[in-house]
């Protein structure tokens, strides 16, 4: 059967299945090394 | 059922340069974000880049280690995402997979970057 | 970059046995639409990585109900209730709420 998640930021359809925030956020700090 | 299939992986050269490819099936491919992640016995899994939507203008992000160097893109009338990569480095060494998300791998292309 | 902190390295389990495996982030994984981004990944050896749970506690299809997936915030914990010797491999938390998305070290699950 065809998957038809959407993962697209422009999208109506649910980001959830992807596993990813619709417009992930830059993270704040740096890991070391 | 959904498929992935990576290839392209091989020996290359320090500063040496490689394309992969994956082609995807069993998925409407272009409503996906598609992604490359590798995985390496020094760093474990790592994101490297991620393609996204002609919706969202096929927005791009890369991890910093491969920025200016490594370039992802799409082709959605075959289905298919590229990783140009060049300048190759020892630390790109890995098994290099294709992904929608987390949701869906493919079985992975091993790179191999030593002189 | 937000670090993922997976305890414990190995988990030796007797068939039948419960298992937890804890993943720590350091940056709190909400997002602003409510949702938790954390998902869960089982590499069996030789194998690319399958997804089993998503967003903190969904089971993907096909997975059985023995995962359970709980978590808020920063604090993650995947258990298996009763370990089958197909559970062996080693288990990786990633976060999809952050760029760059990132990977927990991996446990890795043993059968005693």
């Known amino acids: 059967s065809e998957t038809t998640t959407g993962t697209s930021s422009n999208s109506s359809q649910s980001t959830s299945n992807s596993g990813l925030a619709p417009n992930p956020t830059n993270a704040t700090t740096k890991a070391a090394g | 059922e959904v498929n992935l299939e990576e290839s392209g992986g091989g020996l290359v050269q320090p500063g040496g340069s490689r394309q992969l490819s994956c082609v995807a099936s069993?998925?409407?491919?272009?409503?996906?974000?598609m992604n490359w992640v590798r995985q390496s016995p020094d760093k474990g899994l790592e994101w490297v880049a991620q393609?996204?939507?002609?919706?969202?203008?096929?927005?791009?992000r890369y991890v910093d280690s491969v920025k200016g160097r490594f370039t992802i893109s799409r082709d959605d009338s075959e289905n298919t995402v590229y990783l140009q990569m060049n300048n190759l480095r020892a630390e790109d060494t890995g098994i290099y997979y294709c992904?929608?998300?987390?949701?869906?791998w493919g079985q992975g292309t091993t790179l191999t970057v030593s002189s | 970059d937000v670090v993922m902190t997976q305890t414990p390295l190995t988990l030796s389990v007797t068939i039948g046995q419960p298992a937890s495996i804890s993943c720590r982030s350091s940056?709190?994984?909400?997002?602003?639409?409510?949702?938790?981004?954390l998902n869960w990944l089982l590499q069996r050896p030789g194998q690319s990585p399958k997804r089993l749970i998503y967003v903190v506690s969904n089971l993907d299809s096909g997975v059985p109900d023995r995962f359970i997936g709980s978590g808020s915030g920063t604090d993650f914990t995947l258990k298996i209730s009763r370990v089958e010797a197909e559970d062996l491999g080693v288990y990786y938390c990633v976060q999809g709420t952050h760029f760059p998305y990132t990977f927990g070290g991996g446990t890795k699950l043993e059968i005693k």
């Open positions: 992904t929608t998300g987390t949701d869906y």
């Open positions: 393609i996204q939507l002609k919706s969202d203008n096929y927005a791009i």
């Open positions: 069993g998925l409407t491919f272009s409503k996906h974000w």
């Open positions: 940056q709190s994984l909400l997002y602003s639409n409510g949702k938790t981004y």
